[in-house]
Amino acid sequence: QRKRRNTIHEFKKSAKTTLIKIDPALKIKTKKVNTADQCANRCTRNKGLPFTCKAFVFDKARKQCLWFPFNSMSSGVKKEFGHEFDLYENKDYIRNCIIGKGRSYKGTVSITKSGIKCQPWSSMIPHEHSFLPSSYRGKDLQENYCRNPRGEEGGPWCFTSNPEVRYEVCDIPQCSEVECMTCNGESYRGLMDHTESGKICQRWDHQTPHRHKFLPERYPDKGFDDNYCRNPDGQPRPWCYTLDPHTRWEYCAIKTCADNTMNDTDVPLETTECIQGQGEGYRGTVNTIWNGIPCQRWDSQYPHEHDMTPENFKCKDLRENYCRNPDGSESPWCFTTDPNIRVGYCSQIPNCDMSHGQDCYRGNGKNYMGNLSQTRSGLTCSMWDKNMEDLHRHIFWEPDASKLNENYCRNPDDDAHGPWCYTGNPLIPWDYCPISRCEGDTTPTIVNLDHPVISCAKTKQLRVVNGIPTRTNIGWMVSLRYRNKHICGGSLIKESWVLTARQCFPSRDLKDYEAWLGIHDVHGRGDEKCKQVLNVSQLVYGPEGSDLVLMKLARPAVLDDFVSTIDLPNYGCTIPEKTSCSVYGWGYTGLINYDGLLRVAHLYIMGNEKCSQHHRGKVTLNESEICAGAEKIGSGPCEGDYGGPLVCEQHKMRMVLGVIVPGRGCAIPNRPGIFVRVAYYAKWIHKIILTYKVPQS
């Protein structure tokens, strides 16, 4: 299976790292090459190298290899950061366990099973032997390290320094014994790099011999390092693509850890009477689907065969025939006992009421002093005193420490949307708490909307390229794709962030989504040179009732002539009535033959009261909504446009003033559109961008 071109799979990669030799006696060999694969081939074969190659660095800028007879664990060497360098270390020299019989073991254990020190291979004292380093080139018979040059049963061994004991095996564990995982291994980040049948895993950053979509840069949180076994997609256990062209993928033999506990960040909030979120933590005993059909037992294969067994999904509590959500579906479900209906959702289980009785806040909750200490997604709040540094980073005054006791929900930064807390979860640094405004509370949370006190535009002018304002550029327009298709619009407001609508996500599996930037055509035809396709790494839902989502991209967009960001308005600003604005989208046009190109409809801002009259008084707009009517009868946003922007210009600056969300029909004459008012949520957007970690380009 070890073909020449695949030797890079035998190396552990450390990106942006090089090795510096402190000991001048250490040798190095360099040469100009095109790829890291070429470096790996030469290192593995030791071709033309005056030493045994243990590691190499690929200099991407100079297209150069630096081969080393040492690695990062050697003495006289130190690691150093360097943007243009990638360090590759031969795994055989850094592994402290064996695969199979341990023929490839090149570690530094030098004591036998019974504790006797090994005799050096180059020595004939106390035991004469024929295992000379010169006779076994490539077997690394260095020093007195345990080796298995002939691949014999029993694993690595050595001649011992005890004249009474000629040789003995060394006690080096099998890698499959050392490695262990919890549950189904979704959080496994170990170093197993071969499958249960012994096939070497394909590197995740390679597309040969098998093309795949699990690219490390697209899924930075999945731990796609080198060619280690991982479980990115909810399989029963970790797996990998293999180097065997005839075997696309295989499971890895990783045992379950003796102390099979999940990481805190993995544990969904357990509930028994109701569903929290998607119901992954539901542990109740409802055992029929929504229409009363009984569930099939999870440990049964009748009437439906499946692999969702208790053995395969160890931490998902697949007991009896209770409704569960082991795979991240939209809610708990089960296989049914009706042979004609394979699965059904248990949608009769109520959602948990998170409003905690009488707990409520007034205004924006800055004086809330209740003792709720859980976020709306069920995460436990972390202590305020552990997070003061982060808090100081986004507020410019000294918070009232007397209010910030324990881990209770509070509002120290005057957030317009109520009390919140830090979570201790690096993916969700903070979130709002499930507390509502007190009934009858009319305290405004932002300035009176009837008086245009704040201008929406910041003072800076529109960027100018070659002396011409880029007024025709719509590079901030995003096509959100779901399973190959355009589903919604969105606005690129920062290199790693897209503002869109919560209605755009029919599934919570982020693998199903992509963001297309720089396109004009809904299918990307003719846009190949300017199109950027980015995966989605996280969804951050807006404050309760906002319908907004901030979508984090797996890597930052590259800003160029075709892709740009659009500005946000000032918080709480008002835009004058009759201001001319535009909506953009690839949605439903009503045309029999649509050309697929991005369309624009011109609207003008209408005051909330006037807007309500146009809707025959059936709707009352609040401070979180903005209204715009069509200049041309029958034009406006529709299905497929949701998530897209309402763009207005003020002081020669274009900004996203509204987000399109499903309304009351499409482009009905004399019925203005109602959009989410971005200015009302501007502080929330800035706070997310400031506090959430994004991948570096």
């Epitope: 929504w290 939209e330 809610s331 959702y345 949608s347 779901y482 399973r483 190959n484 298709k485 355009h486 589903i487 209605q503 029919p506 599934s507 809904v522 299918h523 035809r525 690839w586 949605g587 439903y588 029999i592 033959n593 649509y594 050309d595 697929g596 299905e639 497929g640 949701y642 499903p662 029909g665």
Partner: antibody, heavy 120, light 108 residues
């Protein structure tokens, strides 16, 4: 106006394969998905899958993977569905329909259907 | 998969009568992704209502659609002879796309 013209009825033996066609006129063929739907008496309508002729992109209902294969010829504005290893269960009317260009859109135009009968 | 249950399976109505048929989904469906088709014997289905409440081109104004979440309905304000047909609801919320078993509307 938009029209989808399907090929004529087919009488097939079990185990054989059949290739149905759907010729589109009156719109830009490459810009809309072509949907395939099966209708058996007493079984209602079943979605088989779809193809975007411009890119050759396909989505299949898991149930029909291995049974149906979609292709499209943009020079003749024709979409094809091949059904393999036919059994009596495959006897049905097969419709092609025009899907939208965005997720969630309805099937706004339908072909007249092709009746496939599988019998020994 | 999302199962769509239509009721009643068969119904008859007098001319001029108000008719309502329902479509219940096994899990929540976005109103943007719920459509209705009309099919008459020997003909192919026709798009009738898209995105819950929008009438397709040429559909008489006596038809209307409404609903959200798991519960949707199609209503005819005043039954006419040409409305006798089978009506199918269809969800595009989640793959595989599914259709209801249909409601057959007959003239009394």
């Amino acid at each position: 106006q938009v029209q989808l013209q399907q090929s004529g009825a087919e009488l097939m033996k079990p185990g054989a394969s059949v290739k149905l066609s759907c010729k589109a006129t009156g719109y830009t063929f490459t810009g809309y998905w072509i949907e395939w739907v099966k209708q058996r008496p007493g079984h209602g309508l079943e979605w088989i899958g779809e193809i975007l002729p411009g890119s050759g992109s396909t989505n299949y209902n898991e149930k029909f993977k291995g049974k149906a294969t979609f292709t499209a010829d943009t020079s003749s504005n024709t979409a094809y569905m091949q059904l393999s290893s036919l059994t009596t269960e495959d006897s049905a009317i097969y419709y092609c329909a025009r899907g939208g260009y965005y997720y969630g859109s309805s099937f706004d135009y339908w072909g007249q259907g092709t009746l496939v009968t599988v019998s020994s | 998969q999302i199962v769509l249950t239509q009721s009643p399976a068969i119904m008859s109505a007098s001319l001029g009568e108000r008719v309502t048929m329902t479509c219940t989904a096994s899990s929540s469906v976005s109103s943007s992704y719920l459509h209705w088709y009309q099919q008459k014997p020997g003909s192919s289905p026709k798009l009738w209502i898209y995105s819950t409440s929008n009438l397709a081109s040429g559909v008489p104004a006596r038809f209307s659609g409404s609903g959200s979440g798991t519960s949707y309905s199609l209503t005819i304000s005043s039954m006419e002879a040409e409305d006798a047909a089978t009506y199918y609801c269809h969800q595009y919320h989640r793959s595989p796309l599914t259709f209801g078993a249909g409601t057959k509307l007959e003239i009394k």
